[in-house]
């Protein structure tokens, strides 16, 4: 797209070729500037410098307007105008590309006085030689410390000239650094050559841990030697703890086999387990910024000497594209059991999953599924629907991965596939599922529960039924009654107790004759319609000493509804102070239609019922 030309204005110190201010304001990138307002409105645009000389000035422009100026627009501006632009960019915190920063720096020919007013990252592109005096260089490098050095690649000339100048400025002689020196260098400390690492390991290694890019060969060798030497701050590898491993995270790629072998095996195992189980311990994978086309090329070829011969811990130091290129899918499938012991990042696990998906597009075989371990968490329900899981061991292995968490859609799908494959929810399966998910049984619909054979009920523990609703217990209770029918009274009650929410009145009446002392928790879960017909004496016998709890529960169902059905005289015999029973002299007419509608019995008070009472009295006297 051609740059729109502009006619010169009086007082302009730029040239007509500069293009328009509007172009500067609204273009959004280097390569494809967007259409200008000038083009859309038919007005001719004024040169950039001409407009800067008049309001609105640069500082009044919005960050979006300042975002994507091309270098060509700046090259014709006066140094003063460039400085103004740089200050405006800093004030509005506009994020600039490397090219824009380089361009601005190039135009700020003389060293700026007010470094604090300029964008931080712009300083990286200024020549440090321009700040040669002790005060000037200190001011300059104090600001550089806060800049993002990694905007510049390691080999960039601007970056290479910064470190020697910084060392000179801070008065560092030789390779011995203090903690203050390392702090003063900021991100530049990551560029210190191996000799500094060797001589200043104690202060430098903790800084290198957090360097974003990989260390160069020279630095790696020095770090490895320092760590193996066992000096401060980490001490000998044989004394490392899990927290040492955490502290060393960024340096783990430099550890060689000799160091790894020196670390106590229990520590390595504990650290691996922790970092593979807890997402918060997983480092976001470091990526080295490189042009996309190069990455795509590199993805296809495995670097020499990196081809994986087996699945081992050395792979945690591979970048995603290296895993993709260097790990054979068939090797991965045969050694899946090893993946679990290795603390791969979630991004790395994505790569491994992708390899398995390519190898088994129709779904993984059970031999692979059984050893998925934490890779199972990467599977979608759609992936799982392709599987045919028949072994209880496989099911257990995968449920173990999700242990302690809510049932995920993946787990639900897995269980569904497994149960459908088996045809019914047998005892072993139910045993396994309720061990991992105590609420599993109550997550099934009454229809699904109807396929549970009575023999499976033996696997159910009381806590497995905690969240079941009455409809579910209605289905489970008859099965439990059948399952436990051959047990003696006391054992039977212990087993049936948690299913009683589905019991009918007759069964509760029978239990009340057996001195069972049902606890209040069980009583409160009984069906209201099953409790209502029980007499005060039956409830007292059913509950034993637990009857004392009725007062505390008198406002809750089913106790509330039961009290409303009892004669107050009978309730008073309990000595619990229960109130709300039918007063003396009242008749209860069990009009089932009325009760069905209101949920309470129909009471006829003294007024309307006098005639009935008189008749009853007369007949009694007669």
């Amino acid at each position: 797209m051609a740059l729109p030309t502009a006619r010169p204005l009086l007082g302009s110190c730029g040239t007509p070729a500069l293009g328009s201010l509007l172009f500067l304001l609204f273009s959004l990138g280097w390569v494809q500037p967007s259409r200008t307002l000038a083009g859309e409105t038919g007005q001719e645009a004024a040169p950039l410098d001409g407009v800067l000389a008049n309001p609105p000035n640069i500082s009044s422009l919005s960050p979006r307007q300042l975002l994507g100026f091309p270098c060509a627009e700046v090259s014709g501006l006066s140094t003063e105008r460039v400085r103004e632009l740089a200050v405006a960019l800093a004030q509005k915190n506009v994020k600039l590309s490397t090219e824009q920063l380089r361009c601005l720096a190039h135009r700020l020919s003389e060293p700026p006085e007010d470094l604090d007013a300029l964008p931080l990252d712009l300083l990286l592109f200024l020549n440090p030689d321009a700040f040669s005096g002790p005060q000037a260089c200190t001011r300059f490098f104090s600001r550089i410390t806060k800049a993002n050095v990694d905007l510049l690649p390691r080999g960039a000339p601007e970056r290479q000239r910064l470190l020697p100048a910084a060392l000179a400025c801070w008065g560092v002689r030789g390779s011995l650094l203090s903690e203050a020196d390392v702090r003063a260098l900021g991100g530049l400390a990551c560029d210190l050559p191996g000799r500094f690492v060797a001589e200043s390991a104690e202060v430098l290694l903790p800084r290198l841990v957090s360097c974003p890019g990989p260390l160069d060969q020279d630095q790696q060798e020095a770090a490895r030697a320092a760590l193996q030497g066992g000096g401060p701050p980490y001490g000998p590898p044989s004394t490392w703890s899990v927290s040492t491993m955490d502290a060393l995270r960024g340096l783990l790629p430099v550890l060689g086999q000799p160091i790894i072998r020196s670390i106590p095996q229990g520590i390595v195992a504990a650290w691996r387990q922790r970092s593979s189980r807890d997402p918060s311990w997983r480092q976001p994978e470091r990526t080295i910024l490189r042009p996309r086309f190069r990455r795509e090329v590199e993805k296809t070829a495995c670097p020499s000497g990196k081809k994986a011969r087996e699945i081992d811990e050395s792979l945690i130091f591979y970048k995603k594209w290296e895993l993709e290129a260097c790990v054979d899918a068939a090797l991965l499938a045969t050694q899946m059991d090893r993946v679990n012991a290795i603390p791969f990042t979630y991004e790395q696990l994505d790569v491994l999953k992708h390899k398995l998906d390519e190898l088994y597009p129709q779904g993984y075989p059970e031999s692979v599924i059984q050893h998925l371990g934490y890779l199972f968490l990467k599977m979608s329900p759609e992936d799982i629907r392709k599987w045919n899981v028949t072994s209880l061991e496989t099911l257990k292995a995968l449920l173990e991965v999700n242990k302690g968490h809510e049932m995920s859609p993946q787990v639900a799908t897995l269980i569904d596939r497994f149960v459908k494959g088996r045809g019914q929810l047998d005892k072993d399966t139910l045993d396994t599922l309720t061990a991992f998910y105590p609420g599993y049984l109550c997550s099934l619909s009454p229809e699904e529960l109807s396929s549970v054979p009575p023999s499976s009920i033996w696997a159910v523990r009381p806590q497995d039924l905690d969240t079941c609703d009455p409809r579910q217990l209605d289905v489970l209770y008859p099965k439990a009654r059948l399952a436990f029918q051959n047990m003696n009274g006391s054992e039977y009650f212990v087993k049936i107790q948690s299913f009683l929410g589905g019991a009918p009145t007759e069964d509760l009446k029978a239990l009340s004759q057996q001195n069972v002392s049902m606890d209040l928790a069980t009583f409160m879960k009984l069906r209201t319609d099953a409790v209502l017909p029980l007499t005060v004496a039956e409830v007292q016998k059913l509950l034993g000493p637990h009857v004392e709890g009725l007062k505390a529960e008198e406002r809750h169902r089913p106790v509330r509804d039961w009290i409303l059905r009892q004669r107050q005289d009978d309730l008073d015999t309990l000595g619990l102070g229960l109130q709300g029973g039918i007063p003396n002299g009242y008749l209860v007419l069990d009009l089932s239609m009325q009760e069905a509608l209101s949920g309470t019995p129909c009471l006829l008070g003294p007024g309307p019922v006098l005639t009935v009472l008189a008749l009853l009295l007369a007949s009694t006297l007669a």
Epitope: Q497, N515, V516, D519, M524, G544, P545, H546, A552
Partner: antibody
């Protein structure tokens, strides 16, 4: 601090009477069931009975072994629990403790105990 | 009356050991059993209700089990502060009855 302190123990002759007190503090006395428990030397704890709370009308429940001889009452204005013992026998010799009988989450249990007062029945 | 029998008056143990205190009811009491701990000079403290449910605040090294007539209080990884008297109580029927207690001592 929730606390129960018994008093009134001592030596009494067979057939005699004695009244024990239990001063409660740190909780709303009228809301709770209060119980008496005793432990004869070298034997198990024995529950004697309880008096229910205000909401239950301060009704009582006794163990068959003391029913008719022992009476539990309370002075709710003073937060004091009493055990009135009549027709005492040698086998009533024990350390007598009061305890709060508490109901929570559908379960009853003794959650606060006094340190006890000793009663010796001997001629 | 239901008699709760704790056959062992004393039990010796070492710190770190696992120990089991037993209690037998003379008739079926379902799971209506509580366990208490009493340290010298202090009032009893409830540990377990409904035979196997720990009260809040009770360390998970204390575990209750059993139903019907046989009940057990297990303490895994015994700590010095666990040296005390332990007794069971049934609340299946009146009168409420207690076991005589088992005193846990250091070997």
């Amino acid at each position: 601090e929730v606390k129960l302190v018994e008093s009134g123990g001592g030596l009494v002759q067979p057939g005699g009477s004695l009244s024990l007190s239990c001063a409660a503090s740190g909780f709303t006395f009228t809301d709770y069931y209060m119980s008496w428990v005793r432990q004869p030397p070298g034997r198990a704890l024995e529950w004697l009975g309880f008096i229910r709370g205000k909401a239950n009308g301060y009704t009582t429940e006794y163990s068959a072994s003391v029913k008719g001889r022992f009476t539990i009452s309370r002075d709710y204005s003073q937060s004091i629990l009493y055990l009135h013992m009549n027709a005492l026998r040698a086998e009533d010799s024990a350390t007598y403790s009061c305890a709060r009988y508490y109901y929570s989450n559908y379960v009853w249990y003794f959650d606060v105990w006094g340190t006890g007062t000793t009663v010796t029945v001997s001629s | 009356d239901i008699v709760m029998t704790q056959s062992q008056k004393f039990m010796s143990t070492s710190v770190g050991d696992r120990v089991s205190v037993t209690c037998k009811a003379s008739q079926n009491v379902g799971t209506n059993v509580a366990w208490y701990q009493q340290k010298p000079g202090l009032s009893p403290k409830v540990l377990i209700h409904s035979a196997s449910y720990r009260f809040s605040g009770v360390p998970d090294r204390f575990t209750g089990s059993g139903s019907g007539t046989d009940f057990t209080l297990s303490i895994s990884n015994v700590q010095s502060e666990d040296l005390a008297k332990y007794f069971c109580q049934q609340y299946n029927s009146y009168p409420l009855t207690f076991g005589a207690g088992t005193k846990l001592e250091l070997k």
